[in-house]
């Protein structure tokens, strides 16, 4: 399987909400011995590999924001902790998974990574991630609503398997 990032750049005004999205592509095994662990974190553009660094999103670590379930099942993060920080991660039946950030501030600007790990009995993990940039703007140059920029075809599928 692969992870696609439909948009590589989100430009939003301060105070707005944004939903960053990744999509799981390709054959997804729905067997009883397969679990998908999905999460989000902030990162930096490493010299060797993007998304190697894992930094918290609004003080919540990737462990706090994870979802885990079998196949293309729907799931949401535990509400209290995430929602207190204006965050919610969710996953639907079609392989889409997202993080919603409410009331954006300039401090939210940066690189965001989604991670999917396939866990199956007696197999090494299969890891894939996607990366996208969030720019929060203020002042007269800021858009009135979030503007999203589609990924180029080669960027939209970011495959890192182990």
């Amino acid at each position: 399987f692969k992870v696609a990032t439909p948009y590589s750049l989100y430009v939003c005004p301060e105070g707005q909400n944004v939903t960053l999205t990744c999509r799981l592509l390709g054959p997804v095994d729905k067997g009883h011995d397969v679990t998908f662990y999905k999460t989000w974190y902030r990162s930096s553009r490493g010299e060797v590999q993007t998304c190697s660094e894992r930094r918290p999103i609004r003080n919540l670590t990737f462990q706090d924001l994870h979802l885990h379930h079998g196949g293309h099942q729907a799931a949401n993060t535990s509400h209290d902790l995430a929602q207190r920080h204006g965050l919610e991660s969710a996953s639907d039946h079609h392989g889409n998974f997202s993080i919603t950030m409410r009331n954006l501030t300039l401090l939210d600007s940066g690189l965001y990574c989604c991670l999917v790990v396939e866990i199956r009995h007696h197999h090494s993990e299969h890891r894939v991630h996607g990366a996208m940039e969030l720019q929060v703007q203020t002042g007269k140059d800021a858009p009135s609503n979030c503007v999203v920029y589609p990924s180029s075809s080669q960027d939209s599928e970011n495959i890192t398997a182990a």
């Epitope: 662990y37 190697s52 990737f62 462990q63 994870h66 991670l115 866990i119 009995h121 182990a162």
Partner: antibody
């Protein structure tokens, strides 16, 4: 605060079995691997294997197949390592560690010393 | 299995010195390498992940670098409490494997 609390030291006879526990607190137990690592006196770290409590998925170091058995009880947030047919080679400190999927061994238990002696 | 080799079992250093420990993987592990510190009678402690990133709360005198097969762990100014054992580990593919360890000793 994430913690792994391991059971106390064990003195065992050759041929016996021992079961070590690792109780997890401060995180969602079902969503991270529990790793088991062996360290003999004066030696390095040797990975035994892992269990993912949420699904029961297991991975082993081939060397420990038939020697080690992993179980996890999600109702008590406790993982177990059972070692069978003990010999002096099994005398070691056994550590449990947490590993979130796609990540490293970020939190370790204090270790359980197993001594096999007749 | 991927073999992680720490060529020096022991290294001599002095307080205030800069010291580097090397680790070589038997095949390409990209940047999927961690470094752990283990003090006598204690469990290992994660210091560096993904080859070059400090784990939460780790002092900035500890740094890591490398990719592919060659990795280096550096302490910029050794403190007395740093004189202990360090292990590298790959998490590129299971079975997860550790280096044999390098013990930092006083000169």
């Amino acid at each position: 605060q994430v913690q792994l609390q391991q059971s106390g030291a064990e003195l065992m006879k050759p041929g016996a079995s021992v079961k070590i526990s690792c109780k997890a607190t401060g995180y969602t137990f079902s969503s991270s691997w529990i790793e088991w690592v062996k360290q003999r006196p004066g030696h390095g770290l040797e990975w035994i294997g892992e269990i993912f409590p949420g699904s029961g998925s297991l991975n082993f170091n081939e060397k420990f197949k038939g020697k080690a058995t992993f179980t996890a009880d999600t109702s008590s947030n406790t993982a177990y390592l059972q070692l069978s047919s003990l010999t002096s080679d099994d005398s070691a400190v056994y550590y449990c560690a947490r590993r979130p999927p796609g990540w490293f061994f970020d939190v370790w238990g204090a270790g359980t010393t197993v001594t096999v002696s007749s | 299995d991927i073999v992680m080799t720490q060529s020096h079992k022991f290294m001599s250093t002095s307080v205030g010195d800069r010291v580097s420990i090397t680790c070589k993987a038997s095949q390409d592990v990209t940047t999927d390498v961690a470094w752990y510190q283990q003090k006598p009678g204690q469990s290992p402690k994660l210091l560096i992940y993904s080859a070059s990133y400090r784990y939460t709360g780790v002092p900035d005198r500890f740094t890591g670098s490398g990719s592919g097969t060659d990795f280096t762990f550096t302490i910029s100014s050794v403190q007395a409490e740093d004189l202990t054992v360090y292990y590298c580990q790959q998490h590129y593919s299971s079975p997860w494997t550790f280096g044999g360890g390098t013990k930092l000793e006083i000169k």
